[in-house]
């Protein structure tokens, strides 16, 4: 309905999201030197993180380094950190790839493996692969409610994607329920031809596009959103270029009057909500 005489104006938008769902996670712990599986329940506060802008994040996988404290310890063994004598370590050296500051000593890491000693949060995080399958694989059943308010100030028109009387027990479906603002995460990935379980291992970035093509003329009035989805991270990235989406954060606590932390390397999916469109009126 693109009429030549219509005055077009770009949309101004605000977005608010609410993620819901519970995940049962099987974590591996070590008890008296023996590996053991324990069950944990993760709720919204455990797997979502506040983000700026029109984005929300859902954790799908993680690696934990528990009980870290600031002390001296050997670096985690890699080609870069292995040493045979103190000559292989440089006091005060801060390698950007390292987790600490070298003391200049070459110390035993384990068995006959020796690495450079560092001042750091110890024990040093291990270099390891993200768990397979992802620990929060069941996040594909989580849902997100997207509240989108839009404004065309020049036309003095405001509306939102959730209208009164909307059945909020609905789930979005491209053909059967295209106006439902509640999206199942697994369905979003199915729409783009991606497998949620695969992306959940390393994480990724998904775009949720909300397109408003509004005809604000009284006789032809139409102003409803159209939802579509687009994978935004590079699926073809090789290992050296850091595939997926991850970050580290720490939970700090005090034990015996000493500050400690649990370091968590979080893998997950960042959802970017992209709102665009125009409002036309003569």
């Amino acid at each position: 309905s693109d009429k030549l005489y219509q005055r077009k104006e770009p949309v101004i938008s605000s977005v608010h999201t609410k993620v819901k769902g519970i995940a049962e996670v099987k974590e591996e712990i070590v008890e008296n030197g023996v590996k053991k599986l324990v069950h944990s329940v993760f709720d919204t506060a455990d797997y979502t993180f506040p983000l700026q802008g029109n984005s929300f994040f859902v954790m799908t996988n993680f690696l934990k380094t528990e009980g870290q404290e600031q002390r001296l310890c050997p670096e985690y063994p890699t080609r870069r950190t292995l040493c045979s004598s103190d000559r292989g370590c440089k006091k005060g050296w801060m390698d950007p790839q390292s987790k600490g500051i070298q003391t200049g000593r070459c110390v035993v890491y384990e068995g006959n493996q020796k690495t450079c000693e560092v001042s750091a949060w110890c024990p040093i995080e291990a270099v390891e692969e993200a768990p397979r399958p992802a620990l929060l694989n069941s996040a594909e059943n989580f849902t997100v409610l997207i509240k989108n308010n839009i404004d065309f100030p020049g036309h003095n028109y405001t509306t939102r994607n959730i209208l009164p009387g909307l059945n909020i027990t609905c789930t979005f479906h491209k053909t059967q329920n295209p106006q439902c603002p509640i999206f199942r995460l697994g369905d979003i990935f199915r729409e783009t031809g991606d497998n949620f379980s695969d992306v959940a291992i390393q994480g990724g970035i998904m775009g949720i596009e909300i397109y408003w093509d509004c005809n604000l003329d009284r006789w032809f009035h139409h102003c409803r959103p159209k939802y579509s989805f687009r994978r935004l991270d590079d699926k073809t990235t090789n290992v050296s270029l850091y595939p997926g989406y991850n970050f580290r954060y720490a939970k700090y606590y005090k034990e015996n009057n000493v500050e400690k932390r649990t370091l968590i390397k979080v893998f997950g999916i960042r959802f970017d909500i992209l709102v665009f469109g125009t409002g036309g009126k003569f």
Epitope: E69, Q70, R71, T103, G104, R105, S119, C122, K260
Partner: nanobody
Framework: EVQLVESGGGLVQPGGSLTLSCAAS????????MSWHRQAPGKQRTLVAD???????EYEDSVKGRFTISRDNFKNTMTLHMNSLKPEDTAVYFC????????????WGQGTQVTVSS
């Protein structure tokens, strides 16, 4: 003024037990790694056990499984529980403190004598 005061030494029979204590004052105890060292007559002083502020422990091979080092960061004390004592454990035992990122000790106690003999 920094003070490290050891106590608990004495004469004990082989196979017996003893607990050494070290009371610290004048230092921010929870920022210091604490350690026990020993010096037998005519020998060098050697590290026996070390404990980080957060409780990470390391032991000299000859005492592993027999000695246990622990600390209380609220009371500013450290202890060394010594079990299955042997005559070769006879020495003066010193308590030492080093800032958590230092390689060598900053402060030392006066020492306490431990004698293992029948």
């Amino acid at each position: 003024e920094v003070q490290l005061v050891e106590s608990g030494g004495g004469l004990v029979q082989p196979g017996g037990s003893l607990t050494l204590s070290c009371a610290a004052s004048g230092i921010a105890f929870n920022y210091y790694s604490m350690s026990w060292h020993r010096q037998a007559p005519g020998k060098q002083r050697t590290l026996v056990a070390d404990i980080s502020p957060g409780g990470h422990t390391e032991y000299e091979d000859s005492v592993k499984g027999r000695f246990t080092i622990s600390r209380d960061n609220f009371k500013n004390t450290m202890t060394l529980h010594m079990n299955s004592l042997k005559p070769e454990d006879t020495a003066v035992y010193f308590c030492a403190a080093r800032l958590r990122f230092e390689v060598s000790s900053n402060y030392w106690g006066q020492g306490t004598q431990v004698t293992v003999s029948s």
